[in-house]
């Protein structure tokens, strides 16, 4: 005996007034032919003919899930009693965007919760949000197919000056966060060491304030602040940066001992541990992973290892004593 067995017993469903045996029979005992599954769906217990009272289960193809009541029941009149059921996509398809925009990461399908970043060539910014997240079967916020790149006002204003500055006659002066930043500029996630807090700021405002000698402001990453590894690393990197001997300006960012400024993207990219040069007197005594032994590493090695999200405990600054 199995509780799951179905011998076509007449049942009363919650929303039915009559038992199936009480329904008028049109063609007795003929059963039902195979029903048509919804688009992107299939019948799990597939066969040519089904008995009266028998259920079929609707399943969905990989990348889709059932929405609604997924069982059809064979009625005595040879038809199927079926509720509204459909197979909805559980992944997002790579959006179709204008050729000028670059999608990162570039995949065919994205799982729920995965995000993409849209970027433009140097000197241009996305004319709208740059970060989108796959939710259900669509992107949030919705991606407009007219979305394009626009000339970066920061680039226009700055002339031959550095980011955050503008041309005033023959000299460069800091932009005013209030007066010069009314236009749209891409969002950045920024950390303020004074308030020990991070927040989303328009790029123009961040650069203008940084130019006005706001040394407590640190760039974390492009896009609005969102919990996750990128934010986590941004904060840890800021803490490590105070001991860095190298501070190289790079786009919105400043690169430190364990990083290289990518010429093509104007972003700081972590080196890999073997790329670290031995020089430097910024040493740390650390414990790696689950190892009990101590090791002396330089700041570059510490930065690259933490950037790679490898487990490491900093015991103290300076050489290990043993």
């Amino acid at each position: 005996f199995s509780i799951m067995e179905n011998n076509g017993q007449p049942c009363i469903n919650d929303d039915e007034e009559m038992k199936e045996v009480d329904l008028p029979e049109i063609e007795a005992d003929s059963g039902c032919p195979q029903p048509v599954p919804p688009e992107n769906g299939f019948i799990r217990n597939e066969k040519q003919l089904y008995l009266v009272g028998e259920d079929v289960e609707i399943s969905c193809l990989t990348g889709f899930e059932t929405v609604g009541y997924q069982y059809f029941r064979c009625l005595p009149d040879g038809t199927w009693r079926q509720g509204d059921v459909e197979c909805q996509r559980t992944e997002c398809i790579k959006p179709v965007v204008q050729e000028v925009l670059t999608i990162t990461p570039f995949q065919r399908l994205y799982r729920i919760g995965e995000s993409i970043e849209l970027t433009c060539p140097k000197g241009f910014v996305v004319a709208g949000p740059s970060r989108y997240t796959c939710q259900g079967n669509s992107w949030t916020p919705p991606i407009s197919n007219s979305l394009t790149c626009e000339k970066d006002t920061l680039t226009k204003l700055k002339g031959h000056c550095q980011l955050g500055q503008k041309q005033s006659g023959s000299e460069c002066i800091c932009m005013s966060p209030e007066e010069d930043c009314s236009h749209h500029s891409e969002d950045l996630c920024v950390f303020d060491t004074d308030s020990n807090d991070y927040f989303t700021s328009p790029a123009c405002k961040f650069l203008a304030e940084k130019c006005l000698n706001n040394q407590q402001l640190h760039f974390l990453h492009i896009g609005s602040c969102q919990d996750g590894r990128q934010l986590e690393w941004g904060l840890e990197r800021t803490r490590l940066s105070s001991n860095s001997t190298k501070k190289e300006s790079c786009g919105y960012d400043t690169c430190y001992d364990w990083e290289k400024c990518s010429a093509s993207t104007s972003k700081c990219v972590c080196l890999l541990p073997p790329q670290c040069f031995k020089g430097g007197n910024q040493l740390y005594c650390v414990k790696m992973g689950s190892s009990t032994s101590e090791k002396t590493l330089n700041i570059c090695e510490v930065g690259t290892i933490r950037c790679a999200n490898r487990k490491m405990e900093i015991l103290h600054p300076g050489k290990c004593l043993a």
């Epitope: 990162t104 990461p105 995949q107 990453h221 996750g228 590894r229 990128q230 690393w233 290289k260 990518s262 093509s264 993207t265 972003k267 990219v269 972590c270 080196l271 890999l272 541990p273 073997p274 790329q275 670290c276 040069f277 031995k278 020089g279 090791k295 950037c307 790679a308 999200n309």
Partner: antibody, heavy 118, light 112 residues
């Protein structure tokens, strides 16, 4: 100018041993991690092992772990690869490589051929 | 291990022509802090490999700007805008986003 010169390759029987050397010049050898990369005849490239500045940390590809040992002598500006229990599939040209801030394998030696055959 | 699949395995070009080589990874090379460690090397006949492109699109020191790299996630491309006779050899992509570091099987470029 960075120069890396490998030596020590040759013909060896399966199960045999060989020790490769790589003499470095044109830079401060002890300031850099070093690596060995190999290339089987007519095949692609394969990372073999990496060593840190003073030899206190070493890293190997799975297939050579326990058989190969990477080491260095900073006083002699020399990198070594001790290869034991050699197999036919270890037959390759072995390159010694140095990293830079651009890449893990930015500078390469000319390579030394190791043939494992009976 | 990450598998890098290069296409085509060989190609022939005339001087001045543009060519592209594709490198597809079995897994995304974008790490969780937004870095992608993808490199391109050229191995000329009888020589050691030489770095062309690092971090997907940055040009190696002394490499002519006829070479360019692009891509993200799992799909990467090396483009040579005006092929020259000296570009002959085998082109390899390499990833260092995941241990162990792995190389593609190579693409052999011949000049007609």
């Amino acid at each position: 100018e960075v120069q890396l010169v490998e030596s020590g390759g040759g013909l060896v029987q399966p199960g045999g041993s060989l020790r490769l050397s790589c003499v470095a010049s044109g830079f401060t050898f002890s300031d850099y991690y070093m690596a060995w990369v190999r290339q089987a005849p007519g095949k692609g490239l394969e990372w073999v092992a990496t060593i840190n500045y003073d030899g206190s940390s070493t890293y190997y590809r799975e297939s050579v772990k326990g058989r190969f040992t990477i080491s260095r002598d900073n006083a002699k500006n020399t990198l070594y690869l001790q290869m034991d229990s050699l197999r036919a599939e270890d037959t390759a040209v072995y390159y010694c490589a140095r990293p830079s801030t651009e890449a893990l394998f930015a500078y390469w030696g000319q390579g030394t051929l190791v043939t494992v055959s009976s | 291990d990450i598998v890098l699949t290069q296409t085509p395995l060989s190609l022939s070009a005339t001087p001045g022509q543009s060519v592209s080589i594709s490198c597809r990874s079995s897994q995304s090379l974008l790490n969780d802090v937004g870095n992608t460690y993808l490199y391109w090397y050229l191995q000329r006949p009888g020589q050691s490999p030489q770095l062309l492109i690092y971090l997907v699109s940055d040009l190696g020191s002394g490499v002519p700007d006829r070479f360019s790299g692009s891509g993200s996630g799992t799909d990467f491309t090396l483009k040579i805008s005006r092929v020259e006779a000296e570009d002959v050899g085998v082109y390899y992509c390499m990833q260092a986003s995941h241990a162990p570091y792995t190389f593609g099987a190579g693409t052999n470029l011949e000049i007609k």
